[in-house]
């Protein structure tokens, strides 16, 4: 799926007016992108509660076990995002997969990650058939990792 | 930053023609987008080695620690992306920060990210001054995870 | 217009480091985008990547030489340098520095468009 | 690491010949870029991305391909084509430049 871009216009780029409305199901198909997350959603159940699963996806067999929450913008490129969300505060016990363990600390893994907001451009709200897409850095959680607590100097 | 873009075009969207040329910084200052991972890269010299810190960056002190490798595309939006390469292939002991424990892998976490590649328009190759971009995944590893060796049924 | 000259010594001995210093004019490599690398050639053989340094002082190196090499630039100099230690006789050939960082409508190319001379480097002892 | 096999590795040919060579690489790709060398001289861009003629290059150079699979054509040789030449790619990850083993292309 692309999208068309000119060169060389002022505010990088601009592009011509319009009379057609462009279809809704166009701007969808081209926002909607990867619409899953890390591991497939289908098994998340696994990691629904505190402890290390010995099968299924990644996000339940991890020590460090979480579950995926979507985050949905229709304006927003891509569409659909998912957040890691913590299951447990300590780290499972790699032996038994389901006491937790006070040595290790389960934390989320935080990421700037790169979206694109569909916006009226900039002073030509409702004069023009033209959007912008404006580049902002939105904070996802990736995973949760099971790491050791911090010693402060 | 943003990127003006034409509601209704037949290819969602096309552009007008232009004479000049964009400015290098321009582009690049839309595509450069978050030029950081997750967790601060001058610090990654702690997470080099199969070691769990007990201080530095989330990726040095987990017990699956990984460092960042960078893949540059500046052609591609986000230009620069960070894959985690694990540095150990079974998980830390918690106790010592040092021994591998067996009952626990080292797994990378992958995950398709939205990104878009500039390209030139199809069937337009050098008869107008204007790009496409085109949105694509691409497979990055977030991060390195403990996880119990999966059980065969 | 571009130009890119290498400059260093001709002979170096085995275990020795070489230092290698490229001068350039008609471009800045502080232009976003821009970026200049090291080639080399020994006699008879192919052209080998060796180094990059980008605008944002990013930096890449040929994995299998990665301990060996530094590259560093000087904006103000308009000077880039690489380093290369614990030299051997198979580090013989040209060395080649040259810019890339042209950019079309389509986007950057990662072609090295413009190329010094070369400077011939023996390592005998 | 992606590896770049050109071939053939030498080529005898007339002037007014057809040449191609070929340039395939150990894994998909986006574009090839395409240098020629003589004796003594560092190397001229000849194609960037695939396809497009660098500056000044005469339009009997042209190139083409995708995925694995590259080509250089010189439509009718002449004289001052007898060279080596070098196929060339940019990998982002880990990011790389590599260059082909050359074909040097000899007067019959």
């Known amino acids: 799926v692309s999208l068309r871009i000119q060169e060389g216009c002022s505010h990088l780029p601009s592009c011509c007016p319009s009379k057609e409305q462009e279809p809704p199901e166009e701007w969808l198909k081209w926002s909607s992108a990867s619409v899953s997350p890390p591991e497939p959603l289908s098994h998340t159940h696994h990691a629904e509660s505190c402890r290390a699963s010995k099968d299924g996806p990644l996000n339940s067999r991890a020590i460090s076990p979480w579950s995926y929450e979507l985050d949905r913008d229709l304006n927003r490129v891509p569409q659909d995002l998912y957040h890691a969300r913590c299951l447990c505060p300590h780290c499972v016990s790699l032996q038994t997969g389901s006491h937790m363990d006070p040595l290790g600390n389960s934390v989320p893994l935080y990421h700037n990650q790169t979206v694109f907001y569909r916006r009226p451009c900039h002073g030509e709200e409702g004069t023009h058939r033209r959007y912008c897409l404006e580049r902002r850095l939105y904070r996802v959680s990736l995973a949760c990792v099971c790491v050791r607590p911090r010693v402060m100097a | 930053v943003s990127l003006r873009i034409q509601e209704g075009c037949s290819h969602l969207p096309s552009c007008c023609p232009s004479k000049e040329q964009e400015p290098p910084e321009e582009w690049l200052k839309w595509s450069s987008a978050s030029v950081s991972p997750p967790e601060p890269l001058s610090h990654t010299h702690h997470a080099e080695s199969c070691r769990a810190s007990k201080d530095g960056p989330l990726n040095s002190r987990a017990i699956s620690p990984w460092s960042y490798e960078l893949d540059r595309d500046l052609n591609r939006v986000p230009q620069d992306l960070y894959h985690a390469r694990c540095l150990c292939p079974h998980c830390v002991s918690l106790q010592t920060g040092s021994h591998m424990d067996p009952l626990g892998n080292s797994v990378p976490l992958y995950h398709n990210q939205t990104v878009f590649y500039r390209r030139p328009c199809h069937g337009e190759e050098g008869t107008h001054r204007r790009y496409c971009l085109e949105r694509r995944l691409y497979r990055v590893s977030l991060a390195c995870v403990c996880v119990r060796p999966r059980v065969m049924a | 217009q571009v130009t890119l000259k290498e400059s260093g010594p001709t002979l170096v001995k085995p275990t020795q480091t070489l230092t290698l210093t490229c001068t350039f004019s008609?471009?800045?490599?502080?232009?976003?985008?821009?970026?200049l690398g090291w080639i080399r050639q020994p006699p008879g053989k192919a052209l080998e990547w060796l180094a990059h340094?980008?605008?944002?002082?990013?930096?890449h190196y040929k994995p299998a030489l990665k301990s060996r090499l530094t590259i560093t630039k000087d904006t103000s100099k308009n000077q880039v340098v690489l380093t290369m230690t614990n030299v051997d006789p198979v580090d013989t050939a040209t060395y080649y520095c040259?810019?890339?960082?042209?950019?079309?409508?389509?986007?950057?190319?990662?072609?090295?468009?413009?190329w010094g001379q070369g400077t011939l480097v023996t390592v005998s002892s | 690491d992606i590896q770049l096999t050109q071939s053939p590795s030498f080529l005898s040919a007339s002037v007014g010949d057809r040449v191609t060579i070929t340039c395939s690489a150990s894994s998909s790709v986006s574009y090839m870029y395409w240098y020629q060398q003589k004796p003594g001289k560092a190397p001229k861009p000849l194609i960037y991305?695939?396809?497009n003629l660098a500056s000044g290059v005469p339009s009997r150079f042209s190139g083409s391909g995708s995925g694995t699979e590259y080509t250089l054509t010189i439509s009718s040789m002449q004289p001052e084509d007898f060279a080596t030449y070098y196929c060339q790619l940019y990998h982002s990850y880990p990011p790389t430049w590599t260059f082909g083993q050359g074909t040097k292309l000899e007067i019959k």
């Open positions: 008609g471009f800045s490599l502080s232009t976003s985008g821009m970026g």
């Open positions: 991305r695939t396809s």
């Open positions: 040259a810019r890339m960082g042209q950019l079309h409508y389509y986007g950057y190319d990662y072609a090295m468009d413009y």
């Open positions: 340094i980008w605008w944002d002082d990013v930096k």
